[in-house]
Interface confidence: medium
């Protein structure tokens, strides 16, 4: 009987810039689902004693829960569920109509930023620390959740993981992303993307940690068996990952149509909206199904690529099949072919 007290229960908090607050989504056998606040016989406006969600906050490596209750309905993913039975139980859930679902929000205390010790590693005679090992992804300032340099902590010892490009570590990366409540592994990040680049005007919160780890067993199934301590390397790469649960996701909208459910697809890079250019990697309707869902419309009716006769037409390009897989958008400065999508209008 799956509940948020189970050791293998997976949850994440989305729609914020922090892994410790947001809209509650849970992973059930067929993927990620947003939890409706009407679950477990509650009203959509009911507030709960937040301590009931302490296991969820713990699993996200956050502090204690501060609030548990309705989240403003600003975004509805492809799948939302209402669950029944005891609060926190997910063994009896049914899919909900998106327009009926008020999402459930949880705020956990941000983990306290402790300055790691800057002393040399303790001598090897020191008994091994007893605190459970844990992982942390360090993103660059203002960077993405579920993307960054991996740091491994065993008790008070913490450091980055030395990584050689020839290491065959796909299983390990999936295990790490999963352990971080970040879904599955997408790709390795160069260090500049992963948080090594530092704004010179900003104090560095993460000073180099006193020890470093090396991959010991890339097929490990518990953290304590994955890495071994090594002397810190002056050079060489450190392990930096992008996991599928990265936030914020690319936002899309449809413009120039006769309703919000049709139009030319635009995406947002920072504060700027720009046309999304057609790409050969997105020739199936999967991308457009996702765009339609984001507009809270029905499924795709049709899509067509508009002619890019103008060599100066510009826009943004996503090299992946689905926009939700796009960690970065690339600029296309000429011959951008726009795409006109028509989705089913739920309120014709």
């Amino acid at each position: 009987r799956l509940s948020w007290y189970d050791p293998d229960f997976q949850a994440r908090l989305t729609r914020s810039n922090s892994k410790c607050q947001g809209q509650l989504e849970v992973y059930l056998k067929d993927g990620w689902h947003m939890v409706c606040s009407q679950s477990w016989g509650r009203s959509s406006k009911q507030w709960e004693d937040p301590s009931q969600a302490s296991k969820v906050c713990q699993r996200l490596n956050c502090g204690v829960p501060l609030s548990l209750g309705p989240f403003l309905v600003t975004y509805t993913p492809q799948s939302s569920i209402i669950c029944y039975g005891q609060l926190g139980s997910f063994s009896n859930c049914s899919h909900s109509r998106n327009d009926m679902c008020h999402s459930l929000g949880l705020t956990c205390l941000e983990p306290q930023k402790t300055t790691p010790p800057t002393t040399r590693p303790p001598p090897t005679t020191t008994p091994e620390p007893t605190a459970p090992p844990r992982l942390q992804l360090v993103a660059q300032s203002g960077g993405q959740h579920c993307a960054g340099v991996v740091e491994f902590y065993s008790g008070s010892l913490g450091g980055t993981i030395s990584y050689e490009a020839q290491d065959k570590t796909q299983d390990l990366e999936n295990f790490l992303c999963n352990n971080l409540q970040c879904g599955s592994f997408l790709k390795h990040l160069p260090e500049t993307e992963a948080g090594r680049a530092q704004d010179p005007g900003e104090p560095r919160e993460h000073q180099p940690l006193p020890i470093q780890w090396k991959i010991q067993n890339s097929s490990c199934t518990s953290l304590e068996h994955c890495f071994r301590k090594i002397k810190p390397q002056k050079s060489g790469r450190v392990l930096a990952l992008l996991c599928s649960g990265f936030q914020p996701k690319v936002q899309s909208r449809l413009v120039g149509g006769s309703s919000i459910c049709e139009g030319t697809v635009e995406v947002r890079q920072g504060a700027q909206w720009a046309a999304l250019c057609d790409s050969s990697s997105a020739r199936s309707s999967l991308r457009w199904e996702e765009v339609c869902r984001e507009q809270q419309c029905g499924s795709v009716n049709s899509y067509r690529v508009l002619d890019a006769g103008d060599p100066t037409s510009r826009g943004l390009f996503c090299p992946h099949q689905k926009l939700s897989q796009c960690h970065e958008l690339w600029e296309r400065n000429s011959y951008c072919k726009k795409v006109f999508v028509t989705c089913q209008d739920p309120n014709p």
């Epitope: 914020s16 922090s18 004693d49 204690v64 609030s67 205390l109």
Partner: antibody, heavy 119, light 108 residues
Framework: EVQLKESGAELVRPGGSVKISCKGS????????IHWVKQSHIKTLEWIGL????????SYNQKFKDKATMTVDKSSSTAYMELARLTSEDSAIYYC????????????WGQGTLVTVSS | EIVLTQSPTIMSASPGEQVTMTCRTN???????LHWYQQKSGASPKLWIY???NLASGVPTRFSGSGSGTSYSLTISSVEAGDAATYFC?????????FGGGTKVEIK
């Protein structure tokens, strides 16, 4: 009716400390965290930190972590904040506010406690 | 930290005029976590708009909020004498929670 009632104005000598209180009523006190906010004479608002009223766990703005200490007494539904090593820069109105929900806004505020640091 | 810059600092308007104030952030914040408070002279701040565009209980419908990403605004469609106050924006999308410097609205 939801209310947050703060303690009265304080006049403190430089180098001294002061403990101000915020009593919640009209709701389940332990279901909502309490934040503390400073408003200085130039009228800007600065977040000091928050305390979980159910567990007593705290989160401080790094700027105030050596200045403020937040505690809670569940039996009297009261949150406290102690300010230490006071200087004239700490002269301000200090507000407590109730944390409302997963969207992180403050739906009720106390009336404020004026702290004046002067010799 | 996320810095919120409000403009203008002070604005003066005649009754019936429309006024708009903006709140810009130095990095993108989720619209669910951008809120506005009204503070009248000598009083505590009051929640005014939450989640970018939702009016708090008792707030007149002449107030509206909008925005996304790094740019947000509060508009009063037809300003009244009772709207004279300072309006602060606040975010808790990124840690630590921060406020804007405020926009003071004066009525001519």
């Amino acid at each position: 009716e939801v209310q947050l009632k703060e303690s009265g104005a304080e006049l403190v000598r430089p180098g001294g400390s002061v403990k101000i209180s915020c009593k919640g009523s009209g709701y389940t006190f332990t279901n909502f965290a309490i934040h503390w906010v400073k408003q200085s004479h130039i009228k800007t608002l600065e977040w000091i930190g928050l305390i979980s009223t159910s567990s007593g766990d705290v989160s401080y703005n790094q700027k105030f972590k050596d200045k403020a200490t937040m505690t809670v007494d569940k039996s009297s539904s009261t949150a406290y904040m102690e300010l230490a090593r006071l200087t004239s820069e700490d002269s301000a109105i200090y507000y407590c506010a109730r944390h409302y929900g997963a969207n992180n806004y403050f739906d009720y505020w106390g009336q404020g406690t004026l702290v004046t640091v002067s010799s | 930290e996320i810095v919120l810059t409000q403009s203008p600092t002070i604005m003066s308007a005649s009754p019936g005029e429309q006024v708009t104030m903006t709140c810009r952030t130095n990095s993108s914040v989720s619209s669910s976590y951008l809120h506005w408070y009204q503070q009248k002279s000598g009083a505590s701040p009051k929640l005014w708009i939450y989640g970018t565009s939702n009016l708090a209980s008792g707030v007149p419908t002449r107030f509206s909020g909008s925005g996304s990403g790094t740019s947000y605004s509060l508009t009063i469609s037809s300003v009244e004498a009772g709207d004279a106050a300072t309006y602060f924006c606040q975010q808790y999308s990124g840690y630590p929670l921060t406020f804007g410097g405020g926009t003071k609205v004066e009525i001519k």
